[in-house]
């Protein structure tokens, strides 16, 4: 691959030679998911 990441799904996408755009989409959607998860946790 062309680099490394602490996110397994991003690591896989690098192995699959994904574009910077698709990696960015994955990273941003993961962040959105985490924010939503923390929001749900905080509202319990």
């Amino acid at each position: 691959g062309g680099g490394g990441s602490k996110h397994k799904c991003v690591q896989n996408s690098l192995v699959n030679n994904e574009t910077l755009e698709s990696i960015m989409n994955t990273l941003e959607s993961e962040e959105d998911f985490r924010k939503y998860f923390y929001y749900l946790e905080g509202s319990k």
Epitope: S5, E18, L20, M24
Partner: antibody, heavy 121, light 107 residues
């Protein structure tokens, strides 16, 4: 207007570690849609990408340097950093930090001023 | 890795000339191609992104074309301030890679 200001020593001893920082002003390092990267340019030569980081901390490195490079981000200080270990004379270069994102098809639209790093024996 | 081959490596031209620089990628990169201008002692500056989109503030004498593996930067009428080194860069996938550069010199 986003600006990048680089800091760090211009002289590093052979076999030691090069450390540089890049501080983002006039905007947020946490803005969505950007990678923050490091590029270097040996004297009289072309541009070489070292690596990039996303605000999440996910990193992407040049395979030729991967074993020696660490890039990290500190969103609270609006900074990202480069560490290059076990330097040799071949690492003597001008080092630039930069931002690349969706707005410009991932071209580096904002650059730091450049830091000339000389590796001495 | 995607290799970027830029040609020529240097070119001598006069003010008013039309100059064309080419860049070829070893794999299809669609339009994920950026052109930079660099002057001595300065950081590179984006001229063209997305293969053909002109960066704000860049004179219209600069244009970019191409898609896939073959790309061109054209300066329609050279001005004194255009004498510099030009680089292409693929922004399709990591690792990011640059062409070797084209030094544009005064004839």
């Amino acid at each position: 207007e986003v600006q990048l200001v680089q800091s760090g020593p211009g002289l590093v001893k052979s076999s030691e570690t090069l450390s540089l920082k890049c501080t983002v002003s006039g905007g947020s390092i946490s803005s969505s849609g950007y990678y923050w990267g490091w590029i270097r340019q040996p004297p009289g030569k072309g541009l070489e990408w070292i690596g990039s980081i996303h605000r999440s901390g996910s990193t992407f490195y040049n395979p030729s340097l991967k074993s020696r490079v660490t890039i990290s981000v500190d969103t609270s200080k609006s900074q990202f950093s480069l560490r290059l270990t076990s330097v040799t004379a071949a690492d003597t270069s001008v080092y630039f930090c930069g931002r690349h994102g969706r707005d410009y098809y991932y071209g580096m639209d904002v650059w730091g001023q450049g830091t000339t790093v000389t590796v001495s024996s | 890795d995607i290799q970027m081959t830029q040609s020529p490596s240097s070119v001598s031209a006069s003010v008013g000339d039309r100059v064309t620089i080419t860049c070829r990628s070893s794999q299809d990169i669609n339009n994920w191609l950026v052109w930079y201008q660099q002057k001595p002692g300065k950081a590179p500056k984006v001229l063209i992104y997305g293969a053909s989109r002109l960066q704000s503030g860049v004179p219209s004498r600069f244009s970019g074309s191409g898609s896939g593996t073959d790309f061109t930067l054209t300066i329609s009428s050279l001005q004194p301030e255009d004498f510099a080194t030009y680089y292409c860069q693929q922004a399709n996938s990591f690792p990011l890679t640059f062409g070797g550069g084209t030094k544009l010199e005064i004839k």
